[in-house]
């Protein structure tokens, strides 16, 4: 089979007339009356068809032509290439050989970006015109007027620092400073010894250097430096004015401190989110917090607070907090975190709820107040849900039962235990699943519609009777499901029995939606039309 073979990569600058030579195999010789070869360049928006010349069965040349593509937001564009013989026979291109069209000036507005382009593009910096171009597009009167990266000595003038991150760090040093800018050298050697923060040396890290664009350096110790802030200086090989950049903002040396931890106590198992308050806490590039000598899992920080998740403690009692910000170690003997014994759950009352949950549960136990945001959890039919609890004191909290409503399974009329019931109390694993409880879930109440149309007409002062089932779950003890029935937005006085809710309707007239609520269950059986007495007495 005739086919195109890989050879050297094909790079074609936009607007330059040049031939393109392709290696091939088994190219047939066109017979008389047959059309020859053509190269098709599938350029988006402006496809090009160029006559090709077959040299022999293994070589072909797309004749002199120039190519272009739209826009300056793409610096190089790989273009699919087809070779066609005799008008419509496409020569195989199994390796998908492409032509790379490119524009030197596109996305290369600075000398550094220009010189770091792929050397095969042969782009260079036209000094006089301050633009990236091919050599013959630069009106250069001396060799130095057009710089190319291949000249090992090439170096861009006018380096610029655009951004510093972070902008503050501890005096003790160790902060990794990220400097973003333009023309910041072409090779690491260009800047290896050229970065300072004021008088303090900042040692660039080779693995994080991005040619021309980014330097990451580690700031040295500034303990002996009196100035509290300083400009950052980058010198590209030497510090002559053309090769020296100063930062637009100053880097500030600070002394981070902390003075409070909140909450100041939590369970021995850890897992408590704590906030450590202080000043300059967002300084430097790296932070590590330990509580009682163990790492506190860092979440986020700003200048006034660090948040982290406490590790398990070794024993109940106070534990020192240490913060390392780069080479600065922060301590405060006045600020200690207190580990308490893990909370326990002794009783849940009542020991039941309904499918939709939402009923109030009183939970008694020990050390409950050591956890700031306890949650009750239930798992049933493969679905797990949680609800927040309100802590009154160390021995009492109130939770709303989680809903266990799911499409797969619902509790039978006599109730059913959930697969799991427990509490999320920071990292206290022993409470995640309570094996000691006999907690049951009952089905939600089922209420009849007010009528087949959902509309019930009622005389004033007549009671509204809502029929249904599962209205009173057959739970042990004296606790009952607490109902609210609203006529519009007005609650009515209720009497509840096994099969009906008797509602002394408020003194209303007109149409009102009826809503029944019990825990997390809410349902509207329809609309009530109450006629006024005056309408009823009309003939």
């Amino acid at each position: 089979c005739p086919q195109i073979l890989p050879s050297t990569q094909i790079y074609v600058p936009v607007g330059v007339v040049k031939p393109i030579t392709l290696a091939a195999r088994n190219l047939p010789q066109p017979q008389s009356g047959q059309r020859g070869y053509e190269c098709l360049f599938h350029i988006p928006g402006s496809p090009a068809r160029v006559t090709a010349l077959r040299f022999n069965s293994s070589s072909l040349q797309c004749q002199n032509s120039s190519y272009s593509y739209e826009g300056n937001d793409v610096s190089d564009l790989p273009v699919n290439l087809s070779v066609v013989w005799n008008g419509n026979f496409v020569i195989d291109n199994p390796q998908n050989i492409q032509a790379h069209l490119y524009k030197c000036p596109a996305l290369r507005e600075s000398c550094g970006l220009c010189l770091k382009a792929d050397p095969r593009f042969e782009c260079g910096w036209c000094v006089a015109e301050r633009r990236c171009s091919l050599r013959h597009h630069c009106a250069a009167d001396t060799p130095a007027s057009w710089m190319h990266a291949r000249h090992g000595s090439s170096r861009c003038t006018d380096p610029k620092i655009l951004k510093l991150s972070p902008e503050t760090g501890p005096r003790q040093g160790g902060t990794r400073l990220t400097i973003t800018g333009e023309n910041l050298g072409l090779r690491f050697e260009d800047v290896r010894l050229g970065v300072r923060v004021g008088k303090v040396l900042c040692s660039p890290v080779e693995s994080e250097y991005i040619s021309a664009e980014q330097i990451v350096c580690e700031i040295g110790d500034a303990s002996s430096v009196r100035a509290h802030d300083a400009l950052v200086e980058v010198c590209v090989r030497d510090c002559s004015p053309h090769y020296r950049a100063l930062s637009p903002k100053r880097f500030t040396f600070v002394t981070p401190t902390f003075y409070r931890v909140s909450p100041s106590r939590g369970p021995l198992s850890g897992g408590t989110w704590i906030g450590i308050e202080g000043s300059h806490l967002n300084a430097g590039s790296d932070v590590a917090v330990s509580v009682g000598g163990r790492p506190c899992s860092f979440s986020w920080r700003n200048s006034r607070e660090i948040r982290c998740l406490t590790p398990p403690g070794q024993s109940p009692g106070s534990a020192p907090i240490i913060i390392n910000i780069n080479r600065a170690q922060l301590t405060n003997p006045e600020v200690k975190y207190n580990y308490t014994e893990d909370p326990t759950i002794l009783r849940i009352d009542p020991e039941w709820s309904i499918n939709s949950g939402g009923t109030l549960l009183t939970v008694t136990g020990t050390n409950l107040a050591t956890v700031r945001e306890p949650r009750i959890r239930a798992k049933y039919g493969g679905i797990e849900r949680e609800n927040g609890c309100l802590v009154y004191n160390d021995t009492t909290m109130v939770c709303r039962a989680p809903s266990v409503a799911n499409p797969v399974r619902s509790p039978p009329e006599l109730g059913e235990r959930p697969d799991e019931l427990g509490f999320v109390m920071d990292n206290v694993r022993s409470l995640l699943v309570l094996n000691s409880t006999s907690f049951l879930y009952y089905p939600d109440p089922v209420l009849e519609p007010l009528s087949p149309t959902g509309l019930l007409e009622l005389k004033p002062s007549s009671p509204l009777i809502l029929k249904g089932r599962n209205l009173l779950p057959p739970a042990p003890g004296n606790s009952r499901l607490n109902y609210t029935v609203l006529i519009g937005s007005t609650p009515c006085t209720l009497t509840v029995s096994e099969t009906q809710l008797l509602c002394e309707a408020p003194n209303l007239t007109g149409q009102h939606k009826v809503t029944v609520r019990a825990g997390g269950f809410e349902f509207s059986p329809g609309t009530l039309q109450v006629y006024s007495d005056s309408l009823l007495t009309l003939p």
Epitope: V446, E448, P452, T453, G454, L455, R469, K513, E522, S524
Partner: antibody, heavy 128, light 107 residues
Framework: QVQLQESGPGLVKPSETLSLTCTVS??????????WGWIRQPPGKGLEWIGS???????YYNPSLKSRVTISVDTSKNQFSLKLSSVTAADTAVYYC????????????????????WGQGTTVTVSS | DIQMTQSPSSLSASVGDSVTITCQAS??????LNWYQQKPGKAPELLIY???ELHSGVPSRFSGSGSGTDFTFTISSLEAEDAATYYC?????????FGQGTKVEIE
């Protein structure tokens, strides 16, 4: 799918009680999503709703027939029944039973859907 | 009770024609209107519910529109099997009431 079948005598004497039963197959009469209704159609005339019942036994009747109508449900047999007392020749009609769905609108609110499944009807003639 | 007035009482049309039936309620019934089709000797069948919703399995040539008191039922392209009596019925208030029917014949 759900099917309804009416059954009962085709001839009733004036002043007696007409009794019909509708048997539901292919679904449960105890579903909370449906009412079950009776409709009649006198020869050559239009449709007249007689009444509807919920599986719990709650009934709703056409005021024009209320004094003579009783509809009951037997969930164990998956049936509901119609009794119409003191019949006259004007009660001669084809009697249909039908399923009357109660659909939940947004936010768990009922709206009327329309009688979607009907029995094939049974002709009752009132004559001595 | 809510009275339902249907018109015309009968009409004759050719296959492929568009046919329109109207139904008027004696008071506002929102969108709680249904349309039924009854063929001779058969039980009625639900076509349209809630004014304009097509019941499952019903061909899309049947459509309904309107709300309040005035409603329209349309068969966009009449077919021979559409010869039947069509009834409107309201479900807004008990007792449910029906129109007197429109008999559609094929010419």
């Amino acid at each position: 799918q759900v099917q309804l079948q009416e059954s009962g005598p085709g001839l009733v004497k004036p002043s007696e009680t007409l009794s019909l039963t509708c048997t539901v197959s292919g679904g449960s009469i105890s579903s909370s999503s449906y009412y079950w209704g009776w409709i009649r159609q006198p020869p050559g005339k239009g449709l007249e709703w007689i009444g509807s019942i919920y599986y719990s036994g709650s009934t709703y009747y056409n005021p024009s027939l209320k004094s003579r109508v009783t509809i009951s449900v037997d969930t164990s047999k998956n049936q509901f029944s119609l009794k119409l007392s003191s019949v006259t020749a004007a009660d001669t009609a084809v009697y249909y039973c039908a399923r009357d769905p109660v659909q939940l609108e947004h936010s768990r609110y009922y709206y009327y859907y329309g009688m979607d499944v009907w029995g094939q009807g049974t002709t009752v003639t009132v004559s001595s | 009770d809510i009275q339902m007035t249907q018109s015309p009482s009968s009409l004759s049309a050719s296959v492929g024609d568009s046919v329109t039936i109207t139904c008027q309620a004696s008071q506002d019934i929102s969108s709680y209107l249904n349309w039924y089709q009854q063929k001779p000797g058969k039980a009625p069948e639900l076509l349209i519910y809630y004014g304009s919703e097509l019941h499952s399995g019903v061909p899309s040539r049947f459509s309904g529109s309107g709300s309040g008191t005035d409603f329209t039922f349309t068969i966009s392209s009449l077919e021979a099997e559409d010869a039947a009596t069509y009834y409107c019925g309201q479900g807004n208030r008990l007792p449910y009431t029906f129109g007197q029917g429109t008999k559609v014949e094929i010419e």
